[in-house]
C-alpha cells in the first residue's frame, strides 16, 4: 500500500501527545541541545548517570516540533549526533535513543569542536526564530590547548545567533577557565559546577527551571473563544482549555 498524502489535518507521530511523567512540565518554545562529554574523565558507569540525567530532563519537557525540540550530541575529538532538532519522533522514542548513546571513553573531548558543530550544523539556519535556543554543555574534561584556539570565536558566534550556552562542569577535571569564558559572554550563560555526577540529580530541577524560564510561552491560540484545544494521547482523548504554562499539564 502506498502512503497517504500528507494533508494539513494529518497527525504527525509527535503531535500525538504522551501524558506528562512529572508534575513539573516545561511547555515553552525552546530548541535545546544536549552536549555530552564522551571522554574517559568519566567512567562508563558515570556516563550512564550522565545519560540518566539527560533522559530525566527530557521527561520534564514537552517535546514536540511545536514546543520543545531537542538534539543530543556526544562529543570526543569529533561530534556524534544521536538526535536532531527536526527529528519527528515520539518523546518516548527520543528518550530511548538518548539512553542508547554510546560511551566513547576517548582521551580527548573537544568543547571547541562541539561548539563549532553546534554553531555550523545544528544552528546553521534559524528555522524557529520565535523559540529560545539553548545549549547545555555537559563537560567533565579539558581539551588540549592547541584545540581551543577558536573556542571564544565559537562562543561569540553562538551569542550572535542568540544561542544561550549553559555549561555544566562535572568533577575535578572540568575546564573551569572555559566555563568562566562562556559565562562572561552573556548574562544568560549561567554555569553549574558540580563535584561529581552524583550531584546531577540534585541540580536537575534547578537547571530545568532555569532553561524553561529563559524560553517564551507560546502566543495565545487564535481559536474562537468558545473552542478548546483538543489533544489526543495514546488511547485517551482530552479537552483542555489551559493556556501553555511552564508547568501546565495537558493530558
Amino acid at each position: 500500500p502506498t502512503d497517504a498524502p500528507v494533508s494539513p489535518t494529518t497527525l504527525y507521530v509527535e503531535d500525538i501527545s504522551e501524558p506528562p511523567l512529572h508534575d513539573f512540565y516545561c511547555s515553552r518554545l525552546l530548541d535545546l541541545v544536549f552536549l555530552l562529554d564522551g571522554s574517559s574523565r568519566l567512567s562508563e558507569a558515570e556516563f550512564e548517570v550522565l545519560k540518566a540525567f539527560v533522559v530525566d530532563m527530557m521527561e520534564r519537557l514537552r517535546i514536540s516540533q511545536k514546543w520543545v525540540r531537542v538534539a543530543v550530541v556526544e562529543y570526543h575529538d569529533g561530534s556524534h549526533a544521536y538526535i536532531g532538532l527536526k527529528d519527528r519522533k515520539r518523546p518516548s522514542e527520543l528518550r530511548r535513543i538518548a539512553s542508547q548513546v554510546k560511551y566513547a571513553g576517548s582521551q580527548v573531548a573537544s568543547t571547541s569542536e562541539v561548539l563549532k558543530y553546534t554553531l555550523f550544523q545544528i544552528f546553521s539556519k534559524i528555522d524557529r526564530p520565535e523559540a529560545s535556543r539553548i545549549t547545555l554543555l555537559l563537560m567533565a574534561s579539558q581539551e588540549p590547548q592547541r584545540m581551543s584556539r577558536n573556542f571564544v570565536r565559537y562562543v561569540q558566534g553562538l551569542k550572535k545567533k542568540k544561542v544561550i550556552v549553559i555549561p555544566v562542569g562535572i568533577g575535578p577535571h572540568a575546564n573551569l577557565k572555559q566555563i568562566r569564558l562562556i559565562e562572561k559572554q552573556a548574562p544568560e550563560n549561567k554555569a553549574f559546577v558540580l563535584s561529581s555526577v552524583d550531584e546531577l540529580e540534585q541540580q536537575r530541577d534547578e537547571i530545568v527551571s532555569y532553561l524553561c524560564d529563559l524560553a517564551p510561552e507560546a502566543p495565545p491560540p487564535t481559536l474562537p473563544p468558545d473552542m478548546a484545544q483538543v489533544t489526543v494521547g495514546p488511547g485517551l482523548l482530552g479537552v483542555s482549555t489551559l493556556g501553555p504554562k511552564r508547568n501546565s499539564m495537558v493530558l
Epitope: 567512567s43 562508563e44 558515570e46 550512564e48 548517570v49 545519560k51 540518566a52 530525566d56 539512553s99 560511551y103
Partner: nanobody
Framework: AVQLVESGGGLVQAGESLRLSCTSS????????TGWFRQAPGKEREFVAA????????YYADSVKGRFTISRDNAKDMVYLQMASLKPEDTAVYYC??????????????????WGQGTQVTVSS
C-alpha cells in the same frame, strides 16, 4: 518504589541452561540499574551480575564470566539472567535487586535499594 519478582528457577542437570527473569511492578524498570545476587545454603549473599538502566554497561562476577549473560528489555520491564554450562556450585537462591539510575551501577549489595524474594536454582551432578 518498585517491587521485584523473580521467576525461572528450577532443578537442572550440570551442563544445562536456565534463564531467570526479573520483572517490576510500580515505576518503570528503565528507572533502575539492576543486579543479580545469589545465596547458597550457609553462605553469604554474593554478587553475580549487574546491568545499567540503559543496558549500556554490564558487570559479572569472575565465577560466572563467559557462562552467564545479563540483559534487559525496558519495553517489557524485564531483566534476564541467561545461565549456561551450569555447575553444582551454582546452586543457590537467586535474587534480583535494583537501584535508581541516578546512581552508578554497582557490584556491592549495599548499593541496592530494592530486592525480590528470590528464586531457587538447583544444579545436580
Amino acid at each position: 518504589a518498585v517491587q521485584l519478582v523473580e521467576s525461572g528457577g528450577g532443578l537442572v542437570q550440570a551442563g544445562e541452561s536456565l534463564r531467570l527473569s526479573c520483572t517490576s511492578s510500580g515505576r518503570a524498570f528503565s528507572y533502575y540499574n539492576t543486579g543479580w545476587f545469589r545465596q547458597a545454603p550457609g553462605k553469604e549473599r554474593e554478587f553475580v551480575a549487574a546491568i545499567s538502566w540503559s543496558g549500556g554497561l554490564t558487570y559479572y562476577a569472575d565465577s560466572v564470566k563467559g557462562r552467564f549473560t545479563i540483559s534487559r528489555d525496558n519495553a517489557k520491564d524485564m531483566v534476564y539472567l541467561q545461565m549456561a554450562s551450569l555447575k553444582p556450585e551454582d546452586t543457590a537462591v537467586y535474587y534480583c535487586a535494583a537501584n535508581r539510575r541516578q546512581k552508578t551501577v554497582q557490584m556491592g549489595e549495599r548499593a541496592y535499594d530494592y530486592w525480590g524474594q528470590g528464586t531457587q536454582v538447583t544444579v545436580s551432578s
